[in-house]
Structures are given as C-alpha cells and as structure tokens.
C-alpha cells in the first residue's frame, strides 16, 4: 500500500504520499496575441508561451490551444497577472457624452472549462475602472487562489480587450497553476 | 532508497519524499531603506527584516545583503508586495505641454541572480503609471508566481524609486519564497 | 515511526511525512454583508460563504463567525482579494475644502487573532488612495503571503468600508488559506 509504514510494534496505513517534484505544475508567459474568433458573450482568451524562457509545464500538466489541462484531480493554486497599457482614457462627464474609443475598464478572468458541463466557470476575476488623465497609462491586475479541480478540467485566461495587453516582457503578463 | 515502501506482496520505489516542514521558506518584511550605490542600469534593491515580527527564514533559506539565497534546486513560489506612497503627481495635459519627462511610474521587479550567468533575470514585474490628482497617493503592487530555481540562485526585489517605498508597517511591504 | 524508511544496509528516521490531500485548506467567497457592530478602532470584518459554489473548507479547517480557524500549527499561505466599488471620489484641492462623504482610500487587512494574546496581529495590508474622476469606479486589492500560524489561531479579513465591497460575484472577492 502506498504510504504504508512500519515500526517495531505496529503497522499503520496512511493516505497516499507522493513526491512534491512529481506534481503537475505550469508557468506560462505572454506572447504576442493574434486576433482570433471568440464566443460572442465571452471575453477573448490569451494564448501563451509554455517552453521558452521562464515558461514550463511539467508532470503531465499540458498546455494546448490557450488551455492548461488539469491531469489529475486535487487542489490547485492558480494565478495570473496581466499588465494592460493604453492611451488616455477620459472618464469624466465629458466621456459620458460620447468617447466610445477609450477603455473605461480592464478585466481579467481565470476560467475553468469542464467538458461535461455546458457553461464555463469563472474562478477569479480582477476588474478595474480606468480613469487616467495622463497621455498614456499602464497597470497590472494580479489574481491567485486555490481551487478543487478535476482531471480533464481546462483553465484559460480571458481579458476584456486583447489589444491593451502588454506582451512585451515575460515577467509582466503570465499564468500558472500547481497542484498543492 | 528515500521513499521506498513495503507491502506484503510487492515492493515499489517512488521518487524521494520529504517532510513539508523541512522545506526552505522565508517571509521578509520591510525596514527603512538607506541610500546605497547600485548598478547604473538597474533599479535599486530593497533590504529586509528577516527575524523580527512576522519575518522568518527557515530550513537553510538564508537572507544576506538584500538577497534570499536558494539552498536547493526545485520549484518555488515567490511573492512580494511593495506599497508606494507619494505626493501629487501631475500627469494631465498641463504637464505634457511643457514637461518633456514621462509621467511618473512605480515599478517592482523580482530578480534572480545566478553567479554563473552574467545578467540578472527578471522573474516578475509589476509596473504602474501614477497620475494621481489628489494631494497625496498610496498604493500596493503585488506579485507572485512559481519558478524553477537552482541551488545557489539569489533573489532580490528592485524598485524604481526607493524614496516612495512605504516602510512604516511590516504588513504593507514584504517579500517571500517557499519550496513547493 | 512516521516517515521511517528502509534500505538494504541502513535504516534512517526522517521528519513526519503526510499526504498533501490531508492538509487543512479553505477558499471562502463573498456574500452580501449585513451591518454588524465592530470594535471602535478596528475595521469591520467580512463574513463569507464556505460551502456553496467555489467555496470549501476541508481537513479540519473550519469557518465560523467571520473567522477561519487554524486546526494545526505550521506554515500557511494566506490570501484574499476584495473588489471595491464606489461613486466619484473627488480628491483634488476641491475635496480638501469639504467633501466628507467620499472615500479617499480603500484598505484590506488580513488579521490574526490569538486567544492568548490581547491584540490582533495584522498579517497583510493592502491600502490604496482613491482619486477617481469618473462617475463611478471599481478596483480589486489582492494580498497573499506565507505565515507561521499556531493551532487555534483565527484569521479574518477586515476592510475600511463594508459598503464599498463588491459582493455580486464569488470570483471578485474571496479569502483563503492552506497549509504548506
């Protein structure tokens, strides 16, 4: 039995033990985004670097087509940071009158897709109004939390506006998960 | 073999197991910064409290001279928050008219230094434009992610402007890492 | 002995091993807050959902009366995000003259209460000035770090103004902890 232990006068069975180095883990980093079709009522998903530089996947945690694939059930810590950058966003009364081309908010969502379930589940959301009065602005949104995930679940990162994502450096925008 | 297990009818060898309480871990907290010389093209590094209050280092994770020293290879979760505080930063059209310098920004970088590699590696960056119109402003930048680190690697936290770091409370500005 | 290992020519005793799936863990999600009395010089504490949706507690980590109860001593990663939303906050010189009903800052504190110690300990603080010039604003504050906690410690999340907390979605405002 995995995790069984011996001592001179007794024998006990414990829950399975496993080496930490064997656990599914991934850290993905930003790449330049190519425009793609996405579902009408869903924010577009980012795609990611999974091998070069700081990025890696290991122990059966795989990345494919914007998704991290969860290879075994358990509790995972999931995190992402997206750095946004844009030009002036007038958000005073003037804007209300009509300046449609300026972002008024930025949003990041970490979403779980389960094939057996029709609707994606939003695990984490970071959303921020943008009312910058300077000539340009930039800022990160960071998210991270623990979730009970099932083998076969898929995770993705959605953003409100892909054109505002800073893809210039791997340390500015990233996405990761690891089994606890 | 570490992690070898026995059961009545078979013997299996697993990857090494280790007690979680033995893993290298550190949580460092802010102290007042003193002006120091640093490399010309690199943001200054913060120094930290490693023993008092909430701060600790354990299991061969040591702190010395602004660096956290990684005592064994593996995947680490690394995090930091820096709270910045400043006075009014005018970044409206007025400034653009006759102040060619860029709008102020605040930046935190978690950097890895490997002695065998000439250039430091930026693991994480949080950077934000500051265009506050009030009489003073304050805000945190939080970072955290998982990285594969090697024994002997050194981690530090660099900031764009040390004079803006809020060092008044240990819960506002901190830096930590733990082996997964 | 827990964690004892065998090899052909020697016998070694290691620190106790334990299955990761047995560790105390919790992820709590926001619910609508009901006005309650709180200590005069302390920010009000949020209460949480601990069973429905994404929320869970497991392995003797219990939630009761706004507190997460720590069931065993060890190093825990503790995190929270609170999303705030409010109406215009004028924070220019105009405000200084007198607009007392607008928030000029938002603060989240993760606090530890130890029954044997009279004063709560602030573990983490995220505090941000709010100087939004638009008609309304919203933004998250995220916190997370590792702490050495003792069996019986209690954790709570305090905020500067409960009426500004966005309780509309479980992915926007949350609180969690897990034994490392």
């Amino acid at each position: 039995l995995k995790g069984q232990e011996f001592a001179p006068s007794h024998q006990q069975v414990y829950a399975p033990l496993r080496a930490d180095g064997d656990k599914p883990r991934a850290h993905l980093t930003v790449v330049r985004q190519t425009p793609t079709q996405h579902l009408k009522n869903q924010f577009p998903a980012l795609h990611w670097e999974h091998e070069l530089g700081l990025a890696f996947t290991k122990n059966r945690m795989n990345y494919t087509n914007k998704f991290l694939l969860i290879p075994e059930s358990g509790d995972y810590f999931v995190y992402s940071q997206v750095t946004f950058r844009g030009m002036t966003s007038e958000c005073s009364e003037i804007r209300q009158a009509g300046r449609p081309n300026k972002p008024d908010s930025i949003t990041v969502v970490i979403t779980k897709v389960t094939d057996s379930y029709p609707e994606p589940t939003q695990l984490l959301m970071g959303t921020k109004s943008v009312c910058e009065v300077g000539s340009n602005w930039f800022q990160p949104i960071y998210l991270g939390a623990m979730f009970s995930l099932q083998e076969g679940d898929k995770l993705m990162v959605n953003v409100s506006d892909i054109s505002l994502v800073d893809y210039t450096k791997e340390d500015k925008t990233f996405f990761g998960a690891f089994l606890l | 073999l570490k992690g070898q297990e026995f059961a009545p009818s078979h013997q299996q060898v697993y990857a090494p197991l280790r007690a979680d309480g033995d893993k290298p871990r550190a949580h460092l907290t802010v102290v007042r910064q003193t002006p120091t010389q640093h490399l010309k093209n690199q943001f200054p590094a913060l120094h930290w409290e490693h023993e008092l209050g909430l701060a600790f280092t354990k299991n061969r994770m040591n702190y010395t001279n602004k660096f956290l020293l990684i005592p064994e290879s593996g995947d680490y979760f690394v995090y930091s928050q820096v709270t910045f505080r400043g006075m009014t930063s005018e970044c409206s059209e007025i400034r653009q008219a006759g102040r060619p310098n860029k709008p102020d920004s605040i930046t935190v970088v978690i950097t890895k230094v490997t002695d065998s590699y000439p250039e430091p590696t930026q693991l994480l960056m949080g950077t934000k434009s500051v265009c506050e119109v009030g009489s003073n402003w304050f805000q945190p930048i939080y970072l955290g992610a998982m990285f594969s680190l090697q024994e002997g690697d050194k981690l530090m936290v660099n900031v764009s402007d040390i004079s803006l770091v809020d060092y008044t409370k240990e819960d506002k500005t901190f830096f930590g890492a733990f082996l997964l | 002995l827990k964690g004892q290992e065998f090899a052909p020519s020697h016998q070694q005793v290691y620190a106790p091993l334990r299955a990761d799936g047995d560790k105390p863990r919790a992820h709590l999600t926001v619910v609508r807050q009901t006005p309650t009395q709180h200590l005069k010089n302390q920010f009000p504490a949020l209460h949480w959902e601990h069973e429905l949706g994404l929320a869970f507690t497991k392995n003797r980590m219990n939630y009761t009366n706004k507190f997460l109860l720590i069931p065993e001593s060890g190093d825990y990663f503790v995190y929270s995000q609170v999303t705030f939303r409010g109406m215009t906050s004028e924070c220019s010189e105009i405000r200084q003259a007198g607009r007392p009903n607008k928030p000029d800052s938002i603060t989240v504190v993760i606090t530890k209460v130890t029954d044997s110690y009279p004063e709560p300990t602030q573990l983490l603080m995220g505090t941000k000035s709010v100087c939004e010039v638009g008609s309304n604003w919203f933004q998250p504050i995220y916190l997370g770090a590792m702490f050495s906690l003792q069996e019986g410690d209690k954790l709570m999340v305090n905020v500067s103004d409960i009426s500004l907390v966005d309780y509309t979605k479980e992915d926007k405002t949350f609180f969690g902890a897990f034994l490392l």
Epitope: - | P35, T36, Q37, S89, N101, S160, I162, S163 | -
Partner: antibody, heavy 117, light 107 residues
Framework: EVQLVESGGGLVQPGGSLRLSCAAS????????MTWVRQAPGKGLEWVSG????????YYADSVKGRFTISRDNSKNTLYLQMNSLRAEDTAVYYC??????????WGQGTLVTVSS | DIQLTQSPSFLSASVGDRVTITCWAS??????LAWYQQKPGKTPKLLIY???TLQSGVPSRFSGSGSGTDFTLTISSLQPEDFATYYC?????????FGGGTKVEIK
C-alpha cells in the same frame, strides 16, 4: 557614505537670480527623491521644494511658487534650485536633503543666500 | 495647508529630567511625522521617523508617539548633549510643513 554638498549661495540684490547646486555622492542619485529646505537667520526650518527620483514630479511651497524652479541632472548626480525674483525674505541658509516618505534623512551642510541692496 | 503647533516654544530643564515636547497637527496626518534635533550652526539631525521609529544611531532615551493629530517627543533622561532645538515635520500632504520649534535650555 552619503554626501551632499551645496554651492552657489552668495549676495544678490532684490529681484535678482541665483542658482544653487547640490552635488550628491555615495548613493545612486537617480533612485531617490531630493528636496530643498531653508532656514532664515535665527528662525525655524521651512520646506522649499522637492523633486522625484527621475524628475517627473516637482513640488513647491506657496512662498516660492512661480519664482523658484527645482531640477536635477541625474547624469551629473546634481540637484539644482533656480531662484528668480529674489526678495529679502528669501535670505536664508539653503539645505539640500535626501527625502523619503517619512523624513529628510541626510542633509548637506547648507549654503547661505543673502538678498540685500 | 497643515499647520504644526509645537509646545512649548522654550523649555528649561536639568540633566536627568524627563522632557516631553508635543506637536499638534491641524488635520490628521496618520503617522507621517518626523522629529529633528538642531544645534546652533549645525544641520538638522533626524531623530524619529514615522512618528515613533527611532532613527539608527539615535540614543534610546529619545522616543516618539502619536497618530492622527497629536504627537509627542520624549527624552527620558536629559543629557548635556541634548540641549538643542527640536522640530516636528509632517509628510502627509503638500506643502510639507515644520513646527515652530522647541528650544531646550539648561536650567
């Protein structure tokens, strides 16, 4: 070791101009905010002006706004205070200082500015 | 502007005395307050920052307390080298302001 050395003080007539300099050494100048503080003879301390590390933000006391300009040249590790339209009440010892969120830590030895006809 | 009012303006004391100087802010400044010591012909020296934290190298007989609008500098046992002028200063908002000073003289 942090060192701040002011220069440029002297006697000037009312309405005249003067430029003070503060040479910094022993720390990476561009990463730190700097400030000017003055002290009239026999009087208390008065904050005059400040500048952020990269020079993006400047701040002034009402008494000097529009007349004084603070600037810095990070390539020369030098802080400046350009003082125009000087008045008798500007007579003081002018100190430059390193500035963080809760104090003025390191101070120069000061340079005396005398405005008199 | 935030006014800082120091009290007393002058103080006569003897070596070994416990001395307390107060600084009152016209509006709340959290703990963004510093205390300085200045001797004649010398530059000011930082004693206390963030209202209550002792600057490195400053003797432990100096202490600071307070938050919001009321602040105190205490010298637990006055020494000969402590006869000087003491200033408080706020860092909460512009313009940065100093108190008027408290001159501590030998009785």
């Amino acid at each position: 070791e942090v060192q701040l050395v002011e220069s440029g003080g002297g006697l000037v007539q009312p309405g005249g101009s003067l430029r003070l300099s503060c040479a910094a050494s022993g720390f990476t100048f561009s990463s730190y905010a700097m400030t000017w503080v003055r002290q009239a003879p026999g009087k208390g301390l008065e904050w005059v002006s400040g500048v952020s590390g990269r020079g993006g933000s400047t701040y002034y006391a009402d008494s000097v706004k529009g007349r004084f300009t603070i600037s810095r040249d990070n390539s020369k590790n030098t802080l400046y205070l350009q003082m125009n339209s000087l008045r008798a009440e500007d007579t003081a010892v002018y100190y430059c200082a390193y500035w963080d969120i809760s104090s003025f830590d390191y101070w120069g030895q000061g340079t005396l500015v005398t405005v008199s006809s | 502007d935030i006014q800082l009012t120091q009290s007393p303006s002058f103080l006569s004391a003897s070596v070994g005395d416990r001395v307390t100087i107060t600084c009152w802010a016209s509006q709340g400044i959290s703990t963004y307050l510093a205390w300085y010591q200045q001797k004649p012909g010398k530059t000011p020296k930082l004693l206390i920052y963030a209202a209550s934290t002792l600057q490195s190298g400053v003797p432990s007989r100096f202490s600071g307390s307070g938050s919001g609008t009321d602040f105190t500098l205490t010298i637990s046992s006055l020494q000969p080298e402590d006869f000087a002028t003491y200033y408080c200063q706020q860092f909460n908002s512009y313009p940065l302001t100093f108190g008027g000073g408290t001159k501590v003289e030998i009785k």
